[in-house]
């Protein structure tokens, strides 16, 4: 499997409509919670929680602050922590508790605390519960949590130093935690947790399961350096701990290795960054997508692997266990356990079969079973990805977060659309297309290229968004920018399952937002643009330039997978002669203009789609070069109205008699690269057209004409 290609299109921050939310002096917007029924997005940041309109996050609905007292700050600083950064209250848990309240925990200057947030008054109830084991002490430490039926399941560190890891359930009647032992958790970095509900029609009376995902230091491999291993662990919701052995500890905690590697190249991705559980009506069993990087990541590699939850469950239900062994000079401390396995099966949830054998609760489990699971929490079998290979491997990028949406294209094909954020504030949208990856687009969400810390996907039909949180704020982006594709070819070549071309309106439309039936819409996920209707009209831009000047003809081809070439009259130009140059690989520069340069210029692009090369005419320009007699009057500006109700500018610049000839606006360097002098600042007020007068008075006027195009096949 090859590396994923570059994103087809790059949208700069200013190019697309993104909605932003940030408050002055508030940072670390890392906890996001969406209430779809209320159309509200809750945002947990440093020392604050906000409620904003989920359809327009710039509209703040409520805010509440949870600051640390000066006394607490001082005590924290005495322990060697930074008063300006660490000794503050970073909101780390933001979970729904009931229809009217949220459960919120913060680091609270290294004294983690939790409280209930009333959604009606948007005030904390002042419970000030001890957050130990639910929320990290240190804002830099890893954490994850999920609320299941009013009980908080968390993975974090249990002490000030962060040296004691814990997976716990905060419950009034049955609190549970992991054993503090290396075989259970060995310096884990927690990533994600979620509940997987039992299927309603399950015959064996099975239990809901809570899954935890983390990276930890390997116990099974011991080399010169610490080997990191990505893990999936699970506990049963009905677990109540053991009666004597594993009292108030999980009796159902099992963990297994997650495999994400590229077998043909020996590339192993062993650091887990994020996980997304994809639930969809069409999926019998959820699929989880995991985002990885390699441990030694000096080249910026990232990978996404997808797993069937049933594969993981199979490992836990029927897989072999590992057991520690003391073998001299062996790298492997843990080996496969081949001995007898006690019944009921260690780590199994209490199901109908167990109940039939009179094991109605984990408190009834025999000591043999409990002792075994205490000593053998690690499975020997690994959880392998769908198709035994990554869905995506990308070079020169560090991905940070992932969300996935399952959508149906016009032809009925189902696509899992991966939205993956980067450590430079961008969002990639990718799909698998015929055993290859197509990165549809990259959107620069954050202007200052800061890492995306949190990603959230709305699942409500109609208005759908991706929300991204970073240190400086939250950005809301639509799932697709269909309207930005101006032609049928562009719309089809985008190969975006959310977009289709509508011939009646001659626009690229978002499929999920069209109320009308999809009849007549054009979408071709193969990228076959020949399905597009012939363009009978070609739009030409007409320019008038001064003799001796330099012209720059624009070619707005957005695709990073395309390259362009230019035609003049009917010949193909080679844009690296003394006469021509390319600006930004797209725009044509014509130097030392003369009458012979007058005529029709066309920019064509070539873009490979599979083994086909798609050619399209991107821009057409009519150039007219005129010898302008030297005016004797002072410089004048006149604005003329031209066809198409566009304002074109007429610029006349007087030159002093006897002055040296004007310097060209563009110089070609020996390497063939083009250097442009800095542009003078635009003049004029907001109600005047802004006119830039270069040293060479090039632009005389410009207009758009529509000519019958005869050269489209």
């Amino acid at each position: 499997m090859a590396f994923a290609p570059i994103p087809r299109i790059t949208w700069e921050h200013r190019e697309v409509h993104l909605v932003q939310f940030h408050e002055p002096d508030i940072y670390n917007y890392s906890a996001l919670l969406l209430s779809e029924d209320k159309d509200t997005l809750y945002i947990g940041a440093r020392e604050a929680v906000f409620a904003v309109n989920a359809l327009n996050i710039s509209e703040k609905q409520h805010e509440v602050y949870w600051k640390v007292s000066e006394d607490k700050k001082a005590k924290c600083a005495e322990k060697g922590k930074s008063k300006q950064t660490e000794c503050l209250n970073y909101i780390r848990v933001l979970q729904p508790l009931s229809a009217t309240s949220l459960y919120v925990c913060g680091t609270n200057a290294f004294q983690p605390a939790c409280d209930h947030l009333n959604l009606t008054s948007f005030k904390f109830l002042g419970k000030n519960e001890d957050g130990k084991g639910r929320c990290p002490f240190d804002p830099a430490h890893s954490y994850t949590s999920v609320m299941v039926d009013g009980e908080l399941y968390s993975g974090t560190s249990y002490n000030f130093l962060g040296s004691e890891p814990i997976i716990s359930r905060n419950s009034s009647h049955s609190p549970l935690r992991t054993e503090y032992a290396i075989p259970w958790l060995n310096e884990p970095s927690f990533v994600f947790a979620d509940v997987i509900r039992k299927s309603p029609d399950s015959p064996d009376g099975e239990d809901d399961r809570v899954y935890f995902f983390f990276t930890e230091v390997s116990v099974e491999y011991e080399f010169v350096f610490r080997v990191l291993i990505p893990r999936i662990a699970r506990v049963c919701k009905g677990d109540q701990g053991g009666l004597r052995t594993l009292q108030k500890k999980w009796t159902s905690f099992l963990k297994a290795r997650l495999i994400c590697s590229r077998p043909d190249s020996g590339l192993v991705f062993n650091v887990l960054r994020d996980v997304f559980v994809l639930r969809s009506p069409g999926l019998k069993v959820p699929v989880f997508y995991a985002l990885f990087t390699p441990q030694l990541n000096n080249v910026g590699l990232s990978a996404v692997c997808a797993y069937n939850l049933s594969t993981a469950e199979e490992v836990f239900s029927h897989g072999k266990y590992m057991q520690s062994t003391t073998v001299e000079q062996s790298h492997t401390k843990w080996v496969r356990y081949n001995g007898p396995v006690p019944k009921p099966r260690p780590g199994a949830c209490i199901d109908s079969e167990a109940r039939a054998a009179n094991y109605t609760s984990s408190l009834n489990l025999p000591d043999k079973t409990l002792q075994f699971v205490k000593d053998h929490p690690l499975m020997d079998d690994s959880v392998t990805p769908i198709d035994n290979r990554p869905r995506l491997i990308k070079k020169d990028v560090n991905y940070t977060q992932i969300v996935v949406d399952r959508t149906q294209a016009l032809d009925g094909t189902v696509y899992d659309v991966m939205f993956v954020s980067t450590d430079r504030g961008a969002l990639h949208k990718a799909i698998s297309l015929e055993h290859a990856v197509h990165i549809i687009e990259e959107t620069q969400l954050f202007q200052d290229f800061e890492p995306v810390q949190t990603l959230l996907l709305s699942s409500k039909k109609g208005n759908r968004f991706v929300y991204a949180g970073s240190n400086s704020g939250v950005v809301q982006a639509p799932l697709a920018f269909c309207g930005k594709h101006g032609t049928c070819e562009d719309c089809v070549l985008a190969r975006d399952p959310y977009c289709a071309w509508s011939p009646p309106t001659a626009t690229c439309v978002a499929l999920h937002q069209t109320e009308s039936p999809s009849r007549g819409l054009i979408q071709e996920m193969s990228g076959d643009a020949s399905v597009c209707p012939d363009k009978s009209k070609g739009s030409y831009r007409q320019h008038f330039f001064k003799h001796g000047g330099t012209a720059e003809l624009k070619c707005s081809q957005k695709s990073n997978l395309a390259r362009v070439f230019w035609k003049f009259q009917n010949g193909v130009l080679k844009a690296e002669s003394p006469k021509y140059g390319l600006m930004g690989r797209k725009n044509l520069l014509i130097f030392n203009l003369s009458e012979g340069d007058s005529g029709v210029y066309q920019c064509l692009s070539e873009e490979r789609v599979k083994n086909k090369t798609v050619f399209q005419v991107v821009a057409k320009h009519v150039l007219e070069v005129k010898v302008v007699p030297k005016p004797v009057v002072a410089p004048t500006l006149s604005v003329v109205q031209t066809e198409g109700s566009r304002i074109a500018t007429k610029v006349l610049v007087a030159s002093t008699q006897g002055s040296s000839p004007p310097t060209p606006a563009v110089q070609a360097t020996s390497s063939g690269a083009i250097t442009l002098p800095p542009k003078p600042a635009p003049t004029g007020t907001s109600c005047e057209p802004k006119i830039v007068i270069n040293t060479v008075p090039q632009l005389h006027s410009e207009k758009t004409m529509y000519l019958k195009s005869s050269d489209n096949r």
């Epitope: 997978l561 050619f615 005869s710």
Partner: antibody
Framework: EVKLVESGGGLVQPGSSMKLSCTAS????????MAWVRQVPDKGLEWVAN????????YYVDSLKTRFIISRDNAKNILYLQMSSLKSEDTATYYC???????????WGQGTTLTVSS | DIVLTQSPASLAVSLGQRATISCRAS??????????MHWYQQKPGQPPKLLIY???NLESGVPARFSGSGSETDFTLNIHPVEEEDAAIYFC?????????FGGGTKLEIK
Amino acid sequence: EVKLVESGGGLVQPGSSMKLSCTASGFTFSDYYMAWVRQVPDKGLEWVANINYDGNNPYYVDSLKTRFIISRDNAKNILYLQMSSLKSEDTATYYCARDISPGYFDHWGQGTTLTVSS
Amino acid sequence: DIVLTQSPASLAVSLGQRATISCRASESVSIHGTHLMHWYQQKPGQPPKLLIYAASNLESGVPARFSGSGSETDFTLNIHPVEEEDAAIYFCQQSIEDPHTFGGGTKLEIK
């Protein structure tokens, strides 16, 4: 003056691997697509692969895409062709060429000869 | 794949006369008025050298006695007047579809 110099050819056993290099000078390397084209002695030319400006989009002739990897190092102005599981039919002169839109090759190296034989 | 058939396989032309080489594609290589056929010259022990790109555009530094024409599936390379140094093998190449393919070559001898 545009100059392309291939290296890395030679005699190898079937099944083995080989990496060809092409050092470019006289032009801004990162502003051009680059390609490998091969020629069996006294036979025709066969396009092997090409690569876009920054090296993220390689393309191959179908029959070679599982065995050959084209890559580039823009900092060093070098184009590479990593070949594995070599067969006798890979014996050819391998040319590195500058690939210009719409798909022609305006400058070629002198070529490096690869012989795959036991 | 698009197959390019060159004819003749070889030809001998007297000095100063016209040499005409034909290249026929198995399907059209023209689109949007652009003809994606290119011509190269190769002399023994040397790499190919670009002569004509996009059917009729003369590469800089190539003598004006070389010219190209054609559209869709039929293309022609003309050399007039032929000179001694033109003895070589001439190849056509298409770039409308992957893989870019070359013709089998036409050997030009000077009588």
